[in-house]
């Protein structure tokens, strides 16, 4: 039988009456156009909704925007457009919400052509009040908050000036001209690239990378011949043009650009690209594009310095620069990532890693599913997940995979079961163990969201027809109840719930049509009365993550340690609550070869845990450039996986000797780097 239709599915008692009492409709006195929604702060209940109706007529822009505010998680909204003087707000800049619980909001207004500068509206009290500020420049980008101090803002102007404010946008100062890209680093540091000869595009590959640690009082040039740069975890990356040709290499710094090392990654040509797929303070996943228009490349994983890389996955699907990749961090379980590979026959297959890129495998076939037409063997196939690439190809996939850090082990995704991703209408699958095993959860495409740290899953069918039904599950997607939230169906446009999956409120957004006019409408449903009581100790059970063989003493060991979690029993219908904290008990494991990546010059043959020398490097000294000095590596082929906490057990020898020789890598060495003050 279909999921959720088994006899053993217990119904939640009296849920219709409970939900009806907690369903709040708000019809917006508004034209349809577009709507954007932002949560202001965490657990504040404050939502800002900006509706814009925008038509670029030949001589002018015609339209309106309205601003609405809720302070009860979307149950009621108040029109606060008058607080921004009924000004048209530019949606391409979005609503710039301050970090953490600063309560800061910046809206960028549309201004008439002849004006000297742009205009912003600023709030520092969770959008209760706004101050209008006229800018001395026209912004090109959204205002960017410093992660460390929400009073510090930066923006680029349409004339490529870098502007900084130290008092939350009240006063602005141009600290540098001819700027292409600017980013906040740690400790209120700003990194930016500059051009010398004309434009960002013309100087691509000849840009300079600058740093200011005092908001523009003084500067340091930390790189030349720059193509682009990026920040990930504690790493600063720059792609740098080679001296002799049009290739470029990645350089990495872990000290804010004071010293650089060349990453042991292939160089790329003009048509290729590098992409940081994921980064944390331990390591980096880097995609290196293949030559030619192949649509794929190779994933490499770094060591703890971001310098030495191991090949992690071949034929990784990534269409073009800034294009589509299915690479997904499964945030509900440590070490798990999902992505797609492009097979030799041009079919797309899903791969999963449970050990941070050490080994990739296919997803196990769900027990309650048959292999589809793509499968050569009807008994042997795998689950293939639809993500960004499928969405970009306009397949019937309304949502990317979903996981939440506080809903341990839960992953929800659209997929198909066969030898490769299918273009047929997908179903929705769920894993409750971080991707090891899967079950078909819902027939056909759906929108879905996680509430109350996994205590409730909500879904709405993806349909071109108006809808009025929502589905919910209190047992991690095993059984489903349906609730008719309105008598008059609406054209559904999206589900919204507070980021972090701790809320018990869900907002269903859409529009109604009456005669030839349409209006935005939202229905906010509070599930608090469905989960009547707070969860107690007896509602939780111990779960060992990454467990594949309970008989094995090392069962559950990933990256050198295992973790036991307290997880809500599927049969318990209770509230985890907003203050729920994931309870986990880590224990250290003995080291095995699985805790080591292959070192520079070594690789792991398929289905083998031993690292062997790369044939082309056999008998050669392993030397590489580090902090501008040449290093000699003595290794038997292994290095500890970054973030791996194992102790004892296997302990391969690894030694790095300083050869006391200078080496440069088409980059400014620290001695040549210059500083200047304003």
């Amino acid at each position: 039988s279909a999921p959720g239709e088994d006899e053993e599915c217990g119904r939640v008692r009296d849920f219709v009456a409970k939900l009806a009492n907690n369903t709040h409709q708000h019809v917006f006195d508004d034209l349809r156009g577009s709507v954007s929604l932002s949560w202001v702060g965490d657990s504040t209940g404050v939502i800002l909704v900006l509706t814009t109706f925008h038509v670029p007529l030949v001589i002018m822009t015609f339209g309106q925007s309205k601003l609405y505010r809720s302070e009860d998680y979307g149950k009621n909204f108040k029109d606060i457009t008058d607080l921004i003087n009924n000004t048209f707000i530019r949606t391409e800049f979005g609503m710039a919400i301050g970090p953490e619980n600063s309560g800061k909001v910046v809206l960028t207004a549309e201004v008439s052509g002849g004006s000297r500068g742009g205009r912003i509206f600023r709030s520092s009290d969770f959008a209760k009040n706004f101050v209008q500020t006229d800018l001395p420049f026209h912004p090109l980008t959204q205002m960017m908050y410093s992660p460390q101090n929400s009073d510090y803002l930066l923006a680029l102007s349409t004339e490529n000036g870098l502007w900084v404010s130290k008092n939350f946008g009240g006063k602005w100062e141009e600290i540098h001209k001819a700027v292409c890209l600017a980013k906040w680093g740690s400790d209120n540091t700003i990194f930016f690239t500059t051009y010398a000869n004309g434009s960002c595009k013309a100087d691509l590959g000849a840009l300079e990378l600058w740093r200011t640690s005092d908001l523009g009082k003084s500067f340091k040039t930390i790189g030349v011949k720059i193509y682009s740069f990026g920040l990930g975890g504690r790493f600063l990356f720059a792609s740098v043009m080679a001296d002799k040709d049009t290739t470029r290499r990645i350089h990495v710094s872990t000290d804010q650009g004071d010293t650089w090392s060349m990453a042991q990654l292939p160089s790329v040509g003009q048509e290729q690209f590098y992409s940081i797929l994921a980064a944390n303070d331990d390591m980096v996943f880097m995609h290196v594009d293949e030559p030619g228009d192949t649509g794929f490349g190779t994933i490499f994983t770094s060591d703890d310095r971001g310098i030495v890389y191991s090949k992690s996955l071949d034929r990784h699907l990534y269409t073009t620069t800034g294009g589509e990749t299915d690479f997904t961090n499964v945030t509900s379980l440590r070490g798990v990532y999902i992505t797609s590979v492009l097979s030799e026959d041009n079919s797309i297959q899903t791969m999963i890693t449970f050990d941070q890129g050490g080994r990739w495998t296919h997803l196990r076939k769900p027990e309650n599913s048959e292999c589809d037409a793509t499968a050569k063997n009807k008994n042997e196939c795998s689950l293939h997940i639809h993500a960004s690439y499928s969405i970009s190809q306009k397949l019937n996939v309304p949502m990317a995979p979903l996981s939440e850090p506080n809903a341990v082990g839960i992953v929800i995704a659209h997929g198909s079961v066969g030898d490769a991703i299918s273009v047929m209408v997908p179903d929705v699958y769920i894993s409750d163990d971080g991707g090891y095993s899967w079950t078909k959860m819902l027939e056909g495409p759906h929108y879905y969201t996680i509430l109350d740290s996994g205590g409730i899953i909500v879904a709405i069918e993806h349909s071109s027809r108006p809808i009025n039904v929502i589905k919910f599950s209190t047992d991690e997607g095993q059984c489903w109840q349906t609730y008719t939230f309105t008598r008059d169906p609406i054209y559904f446009t999206g589900l919204a719930s507070e980021p972090g999956a701790r809320s018990m409120n869900i907002s269903i957004w859409g529009f109604t049509e009456s005669f030839l006019t349409s209006q935005w409408v939202s229905y906010t449903i509070d599930f608090k009365d469905i989960l009547e009581r707070n969860c107690e100790e007896k509602d939780y059970t111990i779960w060992l993550a990454h467990s594949t063989d309970p008989e094995d003493y090392e069962d559950g060991c990933i990256l050198g340690y295992k973790e036991q979690f307290l997880r809500l029993r599927k049969s318990s219908v209770c509230q985890n609550g907003r203050d729920y904290v994931v309870t986990k008990q880590p224990s250290i494991c003995l080291c095995s070869l699985e805790d080591f990546l292959c070192d520079f010059g070594y690789y792991r043959p398929e289905n083998d845990s031993k690292c062997v020398e790369q044939p082309e490097l056999k008998g050669h000294d392993l030397e590489f450039c580090l902090y501008g000095r040449e290093e000699h590596l003595t290794t038997n082929g292994y290095r500890k996986i970054p973030g791996d906490k194992c102790q004892g057990g296997v302990n391969p020898v690894r030694e790095v000797k300083d050869l006391k020789k200078k080496c440069t890598s088409n980059f400014l060495s620290p001695e040549k780097q210059n500083s200047k003050s304003n």
């Epitope: 034209l31 156009g33 309106q64």
Partner: antibody
């Protein structure tokens, strides 16, 4: 540039069929309700049909009900008018237009340049 | 259906004069949904007034609309040479949408 471009007009015999298309560009087509309006030679304007932004609501003048069908393809930014069982009195310039949209401060509509339909034996 | 009757059928005036055009509805029209259009030979109609009295984008302030219920008026305070054209009223609040028969404003 914001524009509507009609096509598909021409000469057709009484009882025949014709399909008019109207290609929209420069604005978010799916947001707008759309209308067909016609004007017989030397005569006034006559509203023919309208359709809501989603395509869920369709409306017709009594003179064309049962013979004409309005539809839209929002993915192609195109409005259609399928005209069956055409009569001599359907001869006119057919305009496609957005339904009047009024905001807090302003209003506008967009009209195409028109396409001529002649029904004659 | 709401029938709209425009009068006069033709209005002969000189540039600089004031023009007053009338539109009467067979039943009450929500004033939010009455519009006036101008049409010149060989051109598509152009929206002048919406909501009975609000001027559309780019329309000079010599054009004004008034009225409610069943009686509506378009006034051109001082006729310019480019204002000589046919004017239509339209109700757009309920199906079927309907136009008046038109008033031709011609040079005297």
């Amino acid at each position: 540039e914001v524009q509507l471009l009609e096509s598909g007009g021409g000469l057709v015999q009484p009882g025949g069929s014709l399909r008019l298309s109207c290609a929209a560009s420069g604005f978010t087509f799916s947001t707008f309700a759309m209308s067909w309006v016609r004007q017989a030679p030397g005569k006034g304007l006559e509203w023919v049909s309208a359709i809501s932004g989603s395509g869920g609501g369709t409306y017709y003048a009594d003179s064309v009900k049962g013979r004409f069908t309005i539809s839209r393809d929002n993915s192609k930014n195109t409005l259609y008018l399928q005209m069956n069982s055409l009569r001599a009195e359907d001869t006119a310039v057919y305009y496609c237009a957005t339904y009047i949209v009024a905001t807090i401060a302003d209003a506008f509509d967009i009209w195409g340049q028109g396409t001529m339909v002649t029904v004659s034996s | 259906e709401i029938v709209l009757t425009q009068s006069p059928g033709t209005l002969s005036l000189s540039p600089g004069e004031r023009a007053t055009l009338s539109c009467r509805a067979s039943q009450s029209v929500s004033s939010s949904y009455l519009a006036w259009y101008q049409q010149k030979p060989g051109q598509a109609p152009r929206l002048l007034i919406y909501g009975a009295s609000s001027r559309a984008t780019g329309i000079p302030d010599r054009f004004s609309g008034s009225g409610s219920g069943t009686d509506f008026t378009l006034t051109i305070s001082r006729l310019e040479p480019e204002d000589f054209a046919v004017y239509y009223c339209q109700q757009y609040g309920s199906s079927p949408l309907t136009f008046g028969g038109g008033t031709k404003v011609e040079i005297k």
